[in-house]
Interface confidence: low
């Protein structure tokens, strides 16, 4: 008799794929056109990325450092009207994209939480949660919570409001902290909070160190659902050497949890790579005309248009990974096991019951390496086969679907491989 199928875990929508942050509406849409109506026209692009949620804003009225002139219930007219926002929500819903609203209060100011008036700000946030939940948003983000006094108790209260409205709503908190103890203490009082931090960016970017960071994090947070990013708001290029971008995309999409990206991560957008741009919000490069100030500053391979036409581009890789992440059970909610491999490598398996299994091998080093996979430290339920089929490589030249012998597996410098193999009873 066939073995019984393992019962599927309860899956919330944010478990099923990546979140995409648009912190600056104007920079995302390009010069002079950054409003909610314009963003509606970019939803097809977000659909093509197969992201499950859009983390948007802040959009509310905020006069720098002035609590009285900060209204979390009012959209800044520069971004559009409440009606524009409602239209965006409706359009996003039709495309199965959830909208998460950033309510970080003093986003134009020095201290994002008006440090001297925390209580009155907390009340404003509470009212805003109720208001925007009724308006139909799918969740909220608040950032820089290390600067919020009594953050844990406020977050617990805000999570209760959010979940009290519907278990299907999400609260995301962001911190600049990379300290695991601090992160764990924030998570302990909030059962369903998604926390973004700088934890992974505090790395020497070697295979061994990254493996140890990931395993320590997962051990410390137990079996709770987590998110993966390199920061609470920044671009991957601000934290990573260029040659590791593809590797990290592969890793973020295949670790157990929700990958969180910022607009432009999918094309390798660089902060302040072009003259006169604000560091924190570079203009999204849709095509070669996105930066008209300096003719020739933008080449096709830096842009969404150029990369969409190139199957070997970072954007194409992002789309493929996002597609795999959103449809394969082992990547959606599978168990995770690391195992020994050659120096400089980080290797792990994702598997769920009798579904197709995935092997990820990441070479962080600048030299080609034999994978040296040693599966002796894997549980019997996750044993390695002799061969696995290539789903994708972060480097050009390998053919998708080709069977690779795991014993003789070699990786190019900075190459990551995603391989699949069937469950065998």
């Amino acid at each position: 008799r066939a073995p019984r199928c393992r019962e599927l875990p309860a899956q919330k929508w944010w478990h099923t794929g990546a979140l995409y942050r648009i912190g600056d509406l104007q920079a995302f849409q390009g010069h002079g056109s950054g409003n909610l109506a314009g963003l509606k026209g970019r939803l097809d692009y977000l659909s093509s990325l197969k992201v499950k949620g859009l983390v948007l804003g802040p959009l509310h009225k905020n006069q720098k450092d002035d609590v009285a002139q900060t209204d979390l219930l009012q959209i800044d007219p520069n971004f559009g009207s409440k009606e524009d926002f409602d239209n965006l929500l409706q359009s996003a819903k039709k495309k199965s994209i959830r909208v998460i609203l950033d309510l970080t209060p003093n986003y134009r100011g020095e201290n994002l939480w008006f440090s001297t008036q925390v209580d009155s700000v907390a009340t404003k946030v509470k009212d805003a949660l109720e208001f925007w939940l009724q308006a139909g948003v799918d969740g909220f983000q608040v950032r820089d919570i290390e600067n919020l006094k009594d953050a844990s108790s406020f977050l617990a209260e805000w999570e209760n409001i959010t979940k009290g409205f519907s278990e299907d709503r999400l609260l995301i908190a962001g911190t600049n902290s990379s300290d695991l103890q601090q992160i764990v203490s924030l998570l302990e009082s909030n059962k369903d909070l998604l926390l973004t931090s700088s934890y992974l960016s505090d790395s020497s970017f070697t295979g061994e160190h990254t493996k140890s960071l990931v395993t320590q994090y997962l051990n410390a947070t137990g079996n709770r659902w987590c998110s993966w990013s390199l920061s609470q708001a920044g671009l991957l290029t601000s934290f990573l050497p260029a040659q590791l971008l593809r590797l990290y995309q592969l890793m973020l999409f295949t670790l157990p949890g929700t990958p969180v990206f910022s607009y432009g991560d999918e094309i390798g957008l660089k902060a302040a790579a072009l003259p006169g741009q604000p560091v924190e919000a570079p203009v999204m490069l849709w095509d070669e005309s996105s930066f008209p100030d300096i003719p020739g500053a933008v080449s096709a391979n830096m842009t969404v248009k150029g990369q969409s036409e190139d199957p070997g581009s970072l954007l194409s890789l992002f789309r493929q990974l996002s597609d795999q992440r959103s449809k394969e059970r082992s990547l959606l909610h599978g168990d995770f096991h690391t195992f020994s491999s050659g120096p400089g490598l980080f290797s792990y398996i994702r598997h769920w019951d009798q579904n197709e299994r995935f092997l990820v091998v990441l070479n962080f080093g600048d030299v080609g390496l034999s994978a040296g996979l040693q599966a002796s430290d894997l549980p019997a339920s996750a044993s390695l086969p002799t061969k696995a089929d290539l789903v994708l490589s972060t480097q050009p030249g390998r053919e998708e679907g080709s069977p690779l012998e795991l014993e003789r597996l070699k990786l190019e410098p900075h190459e990551g491989l995603l391989l699949r193999f069937p469950y065998v009873a």
């Epitope: 190139d310 199957p311 070997g312 194409s316 493929q320 089929d389 994708l392 490589s393 480097q395 050009p396 030249g397 390998r398 053919e399 998708e400 679907g401 080709s402 069977p403």
Partner: antibody
Framework: QIQLVQSGPELKKPGETVKISCKAS????????MNWVKQAPGKGLKWMGW????????TYADDFKGRFAFSLETSASTASLQINNLKNEDTATYFC???????????WGQGTSVTVSS | DIQLTQSPSSLSASLGERVSLTCRAS??????LSWLQQKPDGTIKRLIY???TLDSGVPKRFSGSRSGSDYSLTISSLESEDFADYYC?????????FGGGTKVEIK
């Protein structure tokens, strides 16, 4: 724009050798695998195999092991198919077509007709 | 090897008519299927990949869909340049295999 341009038609006798070339332009040849596909007159398409343009390693389908050889001249952005000891049943049009990951066979050459007749 | 059974092998249709071609896979191919068009002059063009994604520049009258192991190519309203041979291709595993082809002719 992306193009695969193949060499012209060939008329050969049985036992001879033919070499067909496929020149890639508009992209870097080493970023994409190159497949070869056979179409006999009035028949459908048959996959012959592919060459990993990054490593140069060829893979042949079972029916095309032995007399068939894929090669690569990276500096000239050109892939080639050589057929040795030609037989009448090799009469066909041969296509090159690029592929990478799930973008398999997205661009095709115009085809090269090979006629084998004594 | 994975067999792709394409039907019908030929069909006659009029301009403006809606036509559907089907391709059945003998094993699971998880949506890794493309549709190709071969014009009378022999040139081959990919129309659809990943079962339903339209290649850029391909007219919207072409669409692809999947139902289990059956994959379909639909042309919503035939135009004169659509009279050609159509092949399905699976790229889920090696060797790559093609369907036997469907010839779409003018009635």
């Amino acid at each position: 724009q992306i193009q695969l341009v193949q060499s012209g038609p060939e008329l050969k006798k049985p036992g001879e050798t033919v070499k067909i070339s496929c020149k890639a332009s508009g992209y870097s040849i080493t970023n994409f695998g190159m497949n070869w596909v056979k179409q006999a007159p009035g028949k459908g398409l048959k996959w012959m195999g592919w060459v990993n343009t990054y490593t140069g390693e060829p893979t042949y389908a079972d029916d095309f092991k032995g007399r068939f050889a894929f090669s690569l001249e990276t500096s000239a952005s050109t892939a080639s198919l050589q057929i040795n000891n030609l037989k009448n049943e090799d009469t066909a049009t041969y296509f090159c077509t690029r592929s990478v990951i799930t973008y398999t066979m997205d661009y095709w050459g115009q085809g090269t007709s090979v006629t084998v007749s004594s | 090897d994975i067999q792709l059974t394409q039907s019908p092998s030929s069909l006659s249709a009029s301009l403006g008519e809606r036509v559907s071609l089907t391709c059945r896979a003998s094993q699971e191919i998880s949506g890794y299927l493309s549709w190709l068009q071969q014009k009378p002059d022999g040139t081959i063009k990919r129309l659809i990949y990943a079962a339903s994604t339209l290649d850029s520049g391909v007219p919207k009258r072409f669409s692809g869909s999947r139902s289990g192991s059956d994959y379909s190519l639909t042309i919503s309203s035939l135009e004169s340049e659509d009279f050609a041979d159509y092949y399905c291709l699976q790229y889920a595993s090696y060797p790559r295999t093609f369907g036997g082809g469907t010839k779409v002719e003018i009635k």
